[in-house]
């Protein structure tokens, strides 16, 4: 969380941002809130990005004002217009690109004054893993697959019964480049698994951490998946 009080009396209103991550090819949110104003027409929201000459987005007098918008963001940005009046200046970024990563500034002007706060935005690819029993294998084998990751993640297997066990000797992980030549499909195989045990396939890069659990018994298979973004810090 970054709260922009600023120095040298630069700010007179509080602006708060939250560091976040965007999944390339999907839509992302850059979070920013501020002390609300009673009149929408008095609120100006500007989003800036480091290394970019034009603005990312501008909202003033109750509508988008995109004459200063930089080319790289054309047609890809929107604020939540109906929530601006309550102090939400968050930006929706469509079709997140790898190059959207960097430091952004949320700059607010209201009748109470001006304020700004920066946020770090990471971009990459992350997806939920699915763990299945590989019936084609000669021994009891689990196969963990996740369709889109970038940068290349690490994959670690764990077991509820053999806590602390090192499965690197009995597992094999491969990364296959997807058709767009950026993201990769992650496939990890774990051999010699035992029945009535819960196994976890953990995939992690500097943006996200995802876990796929599987429990195989004589009568059923139970699965559970979880994904967590790693860099959600407020400012």
């Amino acid at each position: 969380l970054i709260i922009g009080f600023g120095i040298s009396g630069r700010h007179s209103i509080t602006v708060t941002t939250v560091a976040s991550a965007g999944n390339i090819g999907e839509d992302g949110i850059l979070s920013c809130t501020f002390e609300p104003d009673i009149k929408l027409s008095d609120i100006v929201i500007q989003w800036l990005k480091e290394g970019v000459l034009g603005l990312v987005h501008e909202f003033k007098e109750g509508k988008d004002e995109l004459s200063e918008q930089d080319e790289m963001f054309r047609g890809r940005t929107a604020v939540f217009a109906d929530q601006v009046i309550v102090g939400n200046a968050s930006l929706r970024l469509k079709n997140v690109q790898l190059t959207d990563a960097g430091t952004y500034k949320c700059y607010i002007i209201t009748s109470k004054g001006k304020g700004n706060a920066n946020l770090e935005y990471k971009t990459g690819a992350f997806s939920m893993p699915e763990v299945n029993v590989d019936y084609n294998a000669s021994s009891e084998t689990l196969r963990c697959e996740a369709p889109r990751w970038f940068p290349q993640p690490t994959v670690v297997w764990a077991s509820q019964v053999d806590q602390g066990a090192n499965f690197s000797e009995v597992s094999n992980t491969s990364f296959e480049l997807n058709s767009e030549n950026v993201t990769m499909k992650v496939v990890s195989v774990l051999y010699n698994v035992t029945i009535n045990n819960t196994y976890s396939c953990m995939i992690e890069n500097d943006i996200a951490k995802a876990t796929g659990d599987i429990k195989v018994t004589e009568s059923e298979i139970k699965r559970r998946s979880h994904l967590q973004l790693l860099n959600s810090k407020a400012s």
């Epitope: 922009g4 009080f5 600023g6 120095i7 040298s8 009396g9 630069r10 700010h11 007179s12 100006v44 500007q46 800036l48 480091e50 290394g51 000459l53 603005l55 501008e58 200063e68 430091t103 500034k105 700059y107 002007i109 001006k114 920066n118």
Partner: antibody, heavy 123, light 112 residues
Framework: QAYLQQSGAELVRPGASVKMSCKAS????????MHWVKQTPRQGLEWIGA????????SYNQKFKGKATLTVDESSSTAYMQLSSLTSEDSAVYLC????????????????WGTGTTVTVSS | DVVMTQTPLSLPVSLGDQASISCRSS???????????LHWYLQKPGQSPKLLIY???NRFSGVPDRFSGSGSGTDFTLKISRVEAEDLGVYFC?????????FGGGTKLEIK
């Protein structure tokens, strides 16, 4: 496109003062901090100081304190620098420059520079 | 004040050659939050400076990828992989970690 238009060349007498302007167009004036830089063949580029149009705060290089005074007129999107008690040492090209990005600790870089104002101090 | 020392003063190159400019600071440019605010500018004859690289190694928008920056602490380098005619001019490094901000003396890139 963001642009900074500076006032024309000045020929001034020693001991006099001069006030030059830097008019911003193509961007919202108050969003960006405005810096002033002195350029001479002998000393190269020297940072004079900065003004934050959002509230009129200023920051000066100790060397130019008492020599330069920075102001802004928000209504006309114009930054001004006044130089006082001029000597031949003040003969230079003076550049205004927009700080394109900053945080609470320091300004980052200058992404738009003005056209420059040449000041010649001579009797 | 932080002193920025640029070498060489003059750099004669042939078009298509690689060029390398060094910039050294009298003290570390790493701020307590980990950022290093060292930037590179090019000033062509009769023009104002233009931003090329910010924060050591980040190319500013619209700057060709033949320009690259590297370094850390007190030692920084600007490289131009294949010099073109439009690259000629004076290159300056500048630090904005410490107030007052200071510039290097400049390196003039010229044709051999």
């Amino acid at each position: 496109q963001a642009y900074l238009q500076q006032s024309g060349a000045e020929l001034v007498r020693p001991g006099a003062s001069v006030k030059m302007s830097c008019k911003a167009s193509g961007h919202t004036f108050t969003t960006y901090n405005m810096h002033w830089v002195k350029q001479t063949p002998r000393q190269g580029l020297e940072w004079i100081g900065a003004i934050y149009p959002a509230n009129g705060d200023t920051s000066y290089n100790q060397k130019f304190k008492g020599k330069a005074t920075l102001t802004v007129d928000e209504s006309s999107s114009t930054a001004y620098m006044q130089l006082s008690s001029l000597t031949s040492e003040d003969s230079a090209v003076y550049l205004c420059a927009r700080c394109g990005f900053y945080d609470d600790y320091y300004d980052w870089y200058f992404d738009v520079w003005g056209t420059g104002t040449t000041v010649t101090v001579s009797s | 004040d932080v002193v920025m020392t640029q070498t060489p003063l003059s750099l004669p190159v042939s078009l298509g050659d690689q060029a390398s400019i060094s910039c050294r600071s009298s003290q570390s440019l790493v701020y307590s939050n980990g950022n290093t605010h060292l930037h590179w500018y090019l000033q062509k004859p009769g023009q104002s400076p233009k931003l090329l690289i910010y924060k050591v190694s980040n190319r500013f928008s619209g700057v060709p990828d033949r320009f690259s920056g590297s370094g850390s602490g007190t030692d920084f380098t600007l490289k131009i992989s294949r010099v073109e005619a439009e690259d000629l001019g004076v290159y300056f490094c500048c630090q904005s970690t410490h107030v007052p901000y200071t510039f290097g003396g400049g390196t003039k890139l010229e044709i051999k």
